[in-house]
Interface confidence: low
């Protein structure tokens, strides 16, 4: 498993190992999670042929995974710091149920899946400290999440593999967009 942020700051340019600023910590946390996702994707791709599936086939899923759109203010055109931060936090909160689903989906990378889940919780806390407009952040309904989790776990093997692949890919894309946007804040 990758070293948790803060334990090795070789990726952060701090000549005298000064304490990390809030934005450095967030940046490092996201990149740590992305490393974890890469490891999980490796196992998924080795185990099934989902990674070779065409994007069109993958798009034909009924998962409602969070995705950045122009209106969210996280792209260079129409960038809006407050709107974007709300979208990032809301999106991460929505991803939590999917990360819970991933917990029983890995054999050799079980620890890694747990690390991604826990690190995402920490990231959300970092971002909530940064956000001023917390009222605009809607927390997913626990009952809805519970029934979604049950539904996902009841799928056949092929659909579960597909779901795992889609979650990891979407989460990676969401984090990469978030990383770029947060570097402007």
């Amino acid at each position: 498993a990758p070293v948790p942020p803060g334990e090795d700051s070789k990726d952060v340019a701090a000549p005298h190992r000064q304490p990390l600023t809030s934005s450095e910590r967030i940046d490092k946390q996201i990149r740590y999670i992305l490393d974890g996702i890469s490891a999980l994707r490796k196992e998924t791709c080795n185990k099934s042929n989902m990674c070779e599936s065409s994007k069109e086939a993958l798009a034909e899923n009924n998962l409602n995974l969070p995705k950045m759109a122009e209106k969210d203010g996280c792209f260079q055109s129409g960038f809006n710091e407050e709107t974007c931060l709300v979208k990032i936090i809301t999106g991460l909160l929505e991803f939590e149920v999917y990360l819970e689903y991933l917990q029983n989906r890995f054999e050799s990378s079980e620890e890694q899946a747990r690390a991604v889940q826990m690190s995402t919780k920490v990231l959300i806390q970092f971002l909530q400290k940064k956000a001023k407009n917390l009222d605009a952040i809607t927390t997913p309904d626990p009952t809805t999440n519970a029934s979604l989790l049950t539904k996902l776990q009841a799928q056949n093997q092929w659909l579960q593999d597909m779901t795992t692949h889609l979650i990891l890919r979407s989460f990676k894309e969401f984090l990469q967009s978030s990383l770029r946007a947060l570097r402007q804040m």
Partner: antibody
């Protein structure tokens, strides 16, 4: 007038360390991504990585572990560890506007030549 | 890692003619348009011509035109001048910023 100037190049022995410095004048480095790019004699451009506004860094996959960036408000340093003769090149620093580090490299220094040889 | 493949060198064009250089990405660049073009003359640093696939940088003559999206991009120089003899590079930004890279370069010879 906005300018970038690299310094610190020269002859270095394989396995040694070398620090190159990029000095900005006419603008503050704190408002931009700053990139390092190199070019071996007679070869193409090779992007090494960048350091962001808030001091985060990203390196090209091939460059990870071989280079370290740091910066102040007027200088950006590139530290090379254990260079090999293949690292012989002119090293440029370049300023980037926009989000993608290489999305808009609008200001370049003239480069400093590093020769790795025993 | 993603690769940017440029038109093989050299490409020659007569003064007053038109030259096109292609740049093919092995996977889509960030937001489909994070691709720039640079001109480099011997002994000089590169000079930014175009960013965002098609936006001309300030001071660059309108004879230079960038087009394309996703994985396929083209730099077109119309009314070629002697001063345009140089090596041209494309550079791409990707979702993962560790993948950012330059193309191999294309030398333009003006006859």
């Amino acid at each position: 007038q906005e300018q970038l100037k690299e310094s610190g190049g020269g002859l270095v022995t394989p396995g040694g360390t070398l620090t190159l410095t990029c000095t900005a004048s006419g603008f503050s480095l704190n408002a931009y991504y700053m990139n390092w790019v190199r070019q071996a004699p007679g070869k193409g451009l090779e992007w090494i990585g960048f350091i962001t506004l808030n001091n985060n860094v990203a390196y090209a996959n091939w460059a990870k572990g071989r280079f370290t960036f740091s910066k102040t408000s007027t200088t950006v340093d590139l530290k090379m560890t254990s260079p090999t003769p293949e690292d012989t090149a002119t090293y440029f620093c370049a300023r980037s506007r926009g989000w993608g580090a290489m999305g808009r490299l609008d200001l370049w220094g003239h480069g400093t030549l590093v020769t790795v040889s025993s | 890692d993603p690769v940017l493949t440029q038109t093989p060198s050299p490409v020659s064009a007569p003064v007053g003619g038109t030259v096109s250089i292609s740049c093919q990405a092995s996977q889509s660049v960030y937001e489909n348009n994070y691709l720039s073009w640079f001109q480099q003359k011997p002994g000089q640093p590169p000079k930014l011509l175009i960013y965002g696939a098609s936006t001309l940088d300030s001071g660059v003559p309108s004879r230079f035109k960038g087009s394309g999206s996703g994985t396929q991009f083209t730099l077109t120089i119309t009314d070629v001048q002697c001063d345009d003899a140089a090596t041209y590079y494309c550079a791409g930004v990707y979702d993962d910023d560790s993948d950012d890279a330059f193309g191999g370069g294309t030398e333009v010879v003006v006859k």
